[in-house]
């Protein structure tokens, strides 16, 4: 039997969609224009590979990241696009009514795109753990919330703790884990008897998962630097994010093997941990001054993360209803949160250094930076996550969790797709 | 020898228009963040606005957003800002600044090493 | 907001000159100091609140760190007699300067 977009899916989807896409052309129509002044054409393309660089990692790297599931590939990697695209139009315009609205139209520049892509990255971190629960109706709502909670989030740390662009955008890690696990908190949870298939990884989606994780890995240092303002930082940024992600994957793939009784590789522990160095990084890589303490990093968090993905599926699963596969989201808590925990070490010595008996105060800071983050992240994601209950969006029943038969056309309607 | 050079200065009615050029030698301009900072007659130094090393970011003043646009071209070694709907109170002499980074323990200083002599402009009916 | 002072100040061949600049929230270290000579444009002296830039005569040094900082001109020579300017790059992306102190000759 073929299984329908439910009918009523089909009328709200379209429609609500649409209508949203009218509003924001509208929105651009009358609110936005292009920066008129650039002048060196060899300056834009140079600019623009790093935009390119950050559309690579979210289209293709985290949409095939997501693709492991058995029943559930196209939906993965086609609804992050879905997402993506637009997360990206709303971003740009929000940062730009945050930020430079008052002087009246919103400026576009390849900047305004680039902090819109890696808003919009947010919502993908975010979506691995509810993906495969969701429709695209749904979808939209949390893309809408997510990058509005992002946004504000990032505005109101910028004005009451001074961080530049670059910092405030590293708390993308621990804000997105954070709201995609409790968004999934709040949906339904057990999977019903005859589907416990569906959320199990098969080898040709694992292999789809595995290039979003090379395409992911061979562009983090573009993320970790897009929003840095001097070449040296950027440098710095890109070297040590390089060293970092490249001891991750070592530790990944030799910490995966220790921690498995016959000595095999997981997949799943892979496809996250070679990330690891990358996320731990991200908030202090153009302050580490020596590749060796960048590489120490990825070690570590290279153990966190096969140790993460080893012990806290189980608990994610029983509490969270998140797939043992669908390990972003603790994984990038856990390494966001070990990113802080190191930026606030260098801020301790930085504040020792200067002598000025200041050290209490600057780390009450950082730690009042980041709860906000966390708390900002955890009451719009059980927003959303309550906002998603609603019955109006018509949410696949649980029997149709993980299935992509519920959301494409398959021609010859077979199961082993 | 590292040096700046600004022009483009003159005498201009308000709410007219004027572009300032500032050329660059002895360093390589793509290398760094500028930017420029004015100065009015008996006045203080004021900073206008600012454009990162590679163009993609440009920052400006609550006093000129809106009328003024940074910008530059590399590959010229050349630094502008275009000045519009002019009032008297720009009336200022304009220096560029390139911007240096230092790396400190938790954050890059930030500080202008290099400036240029000025160019004047003088917002008059 | 930067405040320097004091806004002009009298001083001797020879004397010790201190200004000051307070900030209207923690900046930590990232202040920078400028000299102005009438007509010239302003000359980077310190960075990073105490940070010595090259080609400065070691006489000007810098110290303070959080909101007040100060600038230091242990033997003041002829040739030091200018305006002088606080500037803040805490503030991203806005940079601030301060009003100005002025060093005259007594």
């Known amino acids: 039997m073929s299984s329908k977009y439910p009918r009523s899916v089909r009328r709200c989807l379209p429609l609500w969609a649409l209508t949203l896409e009218a509003a924001l052309i509208l929105l651009f129509y009358f609110f936005t224009h292009y920066d008129a002044s650039l002048e060196d054409q060899k300056g834009l393309v140079a600019s623009y590979q790093v935009g390119q660089d950050l559309t690579v990692m979210a289209a293709i790297g985290l949409g095939f990241l997501t693709s492991s599931f058995r029943r559930h590939s196209w939906s993965s990697v086609a609804f992050n696009l879905f997402m993506l695209a637009l997360g990206v139009q709303w971003a740009i315009l929000l940062d730009g009514f945050l930020s430079q609205f008052p002087s009246g139209k919103v400026v576009i520049t390849l900047f305004s795109i680039r902090l819109a892509t890696m808003s919009a990255l947010s919502v993908l971190i975010s979506v691995d753990a509810v993906l495969g629960k969701v429709n695209l109706a749904q979808l939209v709502v949390m893309v809408l919330v997510e990058v509005t909670a992002l946004g504000n989030l990032r505005m109101v740390i910028s004005n009451i703790f001074n961080t530049d662009y670059h910092m405030n955008m590293m708390h993308i890690y621990v804000f997105a884990a954070y709201f995609g696990l409790s968004v999934a908190w709040c949906l339904p949870k057990p999977l019903p008897e005859g589907t416990e298939d569906k959320d199990q990884t098969a080898t040709i989606p694992s292999l789809s998962a595995m290039l979003g994780a090379l395409f992911l890995w061979m562009f983090w240092p573009s993320f970790n630097s897009a929003l840095l303002r001097s070449p040296i930082e950027r440098k710095n940024a890109v070297f040590n994010t390089y060293y970092a992600v490249a001891v991750s994957v070592v530790t990944a793939i030799s910490g995966s093997s220790l921690a498995h009784p016959q000595g095999k590789i997981s997949k799943t522990y892979v496809h996250s941990a070679v990330l690891a160095g990358g996320v731990a990084v991200g908030t202090s890589c153009h302050l580490i001054p020596s590749p060796w303490l960048a590489m120490v990093l990825g070690l570590v968090a290279g153990l966190i993360s096969v140790g993460g993905a080893k012990y806290l599926p189980g608990c994610c699963n029983r509490v969270l209803g998140i797939p043992h596969s669908s390990i972003m989201g603790y994984n990038f808590s856990l390494l966001g949160l070990l990113g802080e925990i190191i930026y606030i070490v260098l801020l301790v010595l930085d504040t020792v250094g200067a002598g000025n008996g200041m050290i209490g105060f600057q780390v009450l800071l950082s730690i009042g930076e980041l709860s906000l983050a966390i708390v900002i992240a955890l009451m719009s994601g059980l927003l959303t996550g309550l906002l998603l209950n609603l019955k109006i969006w018509k949410a696949p029943h649980e029997a149709k969790y993980f299935d992509d038969q519920v959301f494409w056309k398959f021609p010859h309607l077979a199961v082993g797709f | 020898q590292v040096k700046l050079l600004e022009s483009g200065g003159g005498v201009v009615q308000p709410g007219r228009s004027l572009r300032l050029s500032c050329i660059a030698s002895?360093?390589?301009?793509?290398?760094?963040?500028m930017h420029w900072v004015r100065q009015a007659p008996g006045k203080g130094l004021e900073w206008v606005a600012g454009?990162?090393?590679?163009?993609?970011?440009?920052n400006y003043a609550d006093s000129v957003k809106g009328r003024f646009t940074i910008s530059r071209d590399n590959s010229k070694n050349t630094l502008y800002l275009q000045l519009n709907s002019l009032r008297d109170e720009d009336t200022a002499v304009y220096y560029c600044?390139?911007?240096?980074?230092?790396?400190?323990?938790?954050?890059?200083?930030?500080?202008?090493?290099?400036w240029g002599k000025g160019t004047t402009v003088t917002v008059s009916p | 907001v930067m405040t320097q002072s004091p806004s002009s100040l009298s001083a001797s061949v020879g004397d010790r000159v201190t200004i000051t600049c307070r900030a209207s929230?923690?900046?930590?270290?990232?202040l920078n100091w400028y000299q102005q000579k009438p007509g010239k444009a302003p000359k980077l002296l310190i960075y990073?609140?105490?940070t010595l830039q090259s080609g400065v005569p070691s006489r000007f040094s810098g110290s303070g760190s959080g909101a007040v900082f100060t600038l230091t001109i242990a033997s003041l020579q002829p040739e030091d007699f200018a305006t002088y300017y606080c500037?803040?790059?805490?503030?991203?992306?806005?940079?601030?300067f301060g009003q100005g102190t002025r060093l005259e000759t007594k």
């Open positions: 929230q923690s900046i930590r270290s990232h």
């Open positions: 600044a390139r911007e240096r980074a230092a790396r400190g323990i938790s954050r890059f200083y930030y500080y202008m090493d290099v």
């Open positions: 990073g609140a105490s």
């Open positions: 454009i990162w090393f590679d163009g993609s970011n440009k």
């Open positions: 002895g360093f390589t301009l793509r290398n760094y963040a």
């Open positions: 500037q803040e790059s805490y503030s991203n992306p806005l940079i601030t």
